[in-house]
């Protein structure tokens, strides 16, 4: 027991997605070891020579770090002793997508696990009543998506109805020429009904709900990442 390298330790990663232009997290946990100085964390990326990040002897060691990750990575140093080897990634780019390996060595042994990291853009939709239209309509807007998503409308009253004939969806390229703004308008809506605007690509699914009554408008939005988990 306790001879480094002789035993395997459990390392767990979670498939995750990064939103380009924002912070991302590559999730990795391992069996804790109270001896911080004995813990080595190495992050590697398939197809990249050099390391994404290395943490050892209680501090970062960037001597072998690949240039594309310079100044963009950090572990949560205060959480390493409790078994958190997750990596914070600054300014996620499309090119950060790929297969990563989280390799751990402690006084108890060593282990590693792979994770698939997807990158794209996803954002919460906002639905508003469009009073400018000739008939009452709803406007669903989401500022940043990539790859191009699908957009579908649904209604609580007319469950199963196909709204493609009474809606119009457009995709407008944003200033950085990668992500797009999604705008979808649903026409001929009726009051005392709840409508949902669903935006989905292979990374995320977002839903915006709006309930329109005579006296008020209620909104709710949610976003879920797809295929995230161990």
């Amino acid at each position: 027991f306790g001879i480094s390298g002789k035993h395997f330790i459990t390392v767990t990663t979670f498939t995750s997605a990064g939103n380009i232009g924002e912070d991302g997290t590559l999730s990795c946990t391992f069996e804790p070891d109270i001896k911080l100085n004995g813990i080595v964390i190495q992050w590697l990326k398939e197809g990249i020579k050099g390391l994404v990040h290395e943490f050892k002897e209680g501090k970062d060691d960037l001597s072998q770090q690949h240039e594309m990750f310079r100044g963009r990575t950090a572990v949560f140093a205060d959480q390493v002793v409790v078994g958190n080897a997750s990596l914070r990634l600054k300014n996620v780019q499309l090119t950060d997508a790929g297969t990563y390996t989280c390799y751990i060595r402690t006084s108890k042994g060593k282990g590693n696990a792979n994770l698939e990291y997807k990158t794209g853009a996803f954002s919460m939709p906002e639905i508003n009543v469009d009073y400018n239209a000739s008939s009452e309509s709803l406007r669903c807007e989401a500022p940043r998506w990539f790859p191009q998503p699908t957009v579908a409308w649904a209604s609580q009253v007319d469950q199963g109805a196909n709204f493609s004939e009474v809606s119009n969806t457009s995709f407008e390229l944003n200033s950085e020429n990668v992500t797009m703004k999604v705008v979808s308008v649903l026409y001929n809506v009726t009051i005392n009904n709840t409508y949902s605007c669903m935006i989905e690509n292979d990374i995320a699914k977002a839903t915006g709900d709006i309930k329109v009554t005579d006296s008020e408008v209620k909104r709710r939005s949610q976003l879920q990442l797809l295929n995230s988990g161990p």
């Epitope: 924002e22 970062d60 960037l62 100044g71 990575t73 940043r144 200033s175 950085e176």
Partner: antibody, heavy 121, light 107 residues
């Protein structure tokens, strides 16, 4: 408590060089990037460049490339800014600042008191 | 390189006023915009980073927002100690860049 203490004011002649120091304490010096920013009299802030003391990696503003060198001495937890071929427009207060986020290059969260460099014939 | 265009360059306001300062990035998208306050003869002080995260110890009357190329610093109710010069900083790319600054003066 994070502290950055800079060297004293300097008066230099045009064409000369100046080296400003920034001694860090209160945190692990090799784990955080240190940046340099200058401010000419009555003007705004201008980013010069930064260094990761743990490996000596540097980034420079294109405007200063070839004239500026940022170095560090890990044994004394000190970062240095050297600016050569000085001209009158280089007269400014030079600040060092620690970047938040350890090896992740964040925003500048702790600043030195500033060093006035005057270039005059 | 990304340039940050800050406006206005100066403004006059009274105690209790709501003040808004904007910065526009020349290109790209990322959330790495910070805001600083600087008083005469002093080093800048970090107020907000990552577009909207308040630095510990900074009063909640300061807030940041923005997306795409447009970012905003708002002071909800100006206090006497808030009269100073404010700068935005873009720090998402390899090369950092400050805005030109906005001087907030007493009306």
């Amino acid at each position: 408590e994070v502290q950055l203490v800079q060297s004293g004011a300097e008066v230099k002649k045009p064409g000369a060089s100046v080296k400003v120091s920034c001694k860090a304490s209160g945190y692990t010096f090799t784990s955080y990037w240190i940046g340099w920013v200058r401010q000419a009299p009555g003007q705004g802030l201008e980013w010069i460049g930064d260094i990761y003391p743990g490996g000596g990696y540097t980034n420079y503003n294109e405007k200063f490339k070839g004239r500026v060198t940022i170095t560090r001495d890990t044994s004394t937890s000190t970062a240095y800014l050297e600016l050569s071929s000085l001209r009158s427009e280089d007269t400014a207060v030079y600040y060092c600042a620690r970047l938040d986020g350890s090896s992740y290059r964040g925003a500048m969260d702790s600043w030195g008191q500033g060093t006035l460099v005057t270039v005059s014939s | 390189d990304i340039q940050m265009t800050q406006s206005p360059s100066s403004l006059s306001a009274s105690v209790g006023d709501r003040v808004t300062i904007t910065c526009k990035a020349s290109q790209g998208f990322n959330k790495y915009v910070a805001w600083y306050q600087q008083k005469p003869g002093k080093a800048p002080k970090l107020l907000i980073y990552y577009t909207s995260t308040l630095q510990p110890g900074v009063p909640s009357r300061f807030s940041g927002s923005g997306s795409g190329r447009d970012y905003t610093l708002t002071i909800s109710s100006l206090q006497p100690e808030d009269f100073a010069t404010y700068y935005c900083l873009q720090y998402g790319n390899l090369l950092y860049a400050f805005g030109q600054g906005t001087k907030v003066e007493i009306k």
